[in-house]
Interface confidence: medium
């Protein structure tokens, strides 16, 4: 059940968001979330994941990119991009959305 907390081994992740209590956190996986709100520059947040693993499944869109990894500090030096609106089924074999 992706909503239940993960009980696997924990990894240390870079934490850079308003919710961080310090420069790193410990979780089941690391996250980077890039969000663009209407009329604003994209905001990138780094942290830890323990709940809602299904968020890692999502395809990047023009508004949000939710990236997950599960090795030591794997979210530290990661830069995400927001993708075009065209679905991947119309772009077989190409990169991105």
């Amino acid at each position: 059940d992706p909503v239940k907390p993960s009980r696997g081994p924990l990894v240390t992740c870079t934490c850079e968001s308003p919710h961080c209590k310090g420069p790193t956190c410990r979780g089941a996986w690391c996250t980077v979330v890039l969000v663009r709100e209407e009329g604003r520059h994209p905001q990138e947040h780094r942290g830890c994941g323990n709940l809602h693993r299904e968020l890692c499944r999502g395809r990047p869109t023009e508004f949000v990119n939710h990236y997950c990894c599960d090795s030591h500090l794997c979210n530290h030096n990661v830069s995400l991009v927001l993708e075009a609106t065209q679905p991947p089924s119309e772009q077989p074999g190409t990169d991105g959305q």
């Epitope: 996986w29 980077v32 990236y67 990894c69 090795s71 794997c74 030096n77 990661v78 991009v81």
Partner: nanobody
Framework: QVQLVESGGGLVQPGGSLRLSCAAS????????MGWFRQAPGNEREFVAF???????DYADSVKGRFTISRDNAKKTVTLQMNSLKAEDTAVYYC??????????????WGQGTLVTVSS
């Protein structure tokens, strides 16, 4: 650029098994998430399974207990073992990888797709 080559699709009877493989090549610095989506005719592409580099996995509810994802980081391959196949598993299966090619930028790359048909 990253290239993905899928194999293993085909026609199988209900209750049968298939093993899909996907090999990544190109100027890859690091591979993170690798996984599979599928798209049945007339439907949107839907998530099937993923596996992160450290072994974290997740599956769509419809395939849990029947499908198993695995990966070989050294060979840059991801495999989907599909057992107890049903007619509703018929779809084009697309593998994807989230890869770092330049030590910083992460992008998701897609394969061309391989057709799985479950029919008697």
């Amino acid at each position: 650029q990253v290239q993905l080559v899928e194999s293993g699709g085909g026609l199988v009877q209900p209750g049968g098994s298939l093993r899909l493989s996907c090999a990544a090549s190109g100027s890859i610095f690091r591979l993170e998430s690798m996984g599979w989506f599928r798209q049945a005719p007339g439907n949107e592409r839907e998530f099937v399974a993923f596996m992160l580099s450290g072994g974290t996995t997740d599956y769509a509810d419809s395939v849990k207990g029947r499908f198993t994802i695995s990966r070989d980081n050294a060979k840059k391959t991801v495999t989907l073992q599909m057992n107890s196949l049903k007619a509703e598993d018929t779809a084009v299966y697309y593998c994807y990888v989230e890869a770092t090619t330049d030590r910083i930028g992460i992008k998701r790359y897609w394969g061309q797709g391989t057709l799985v048909t479950v029919s008697s």
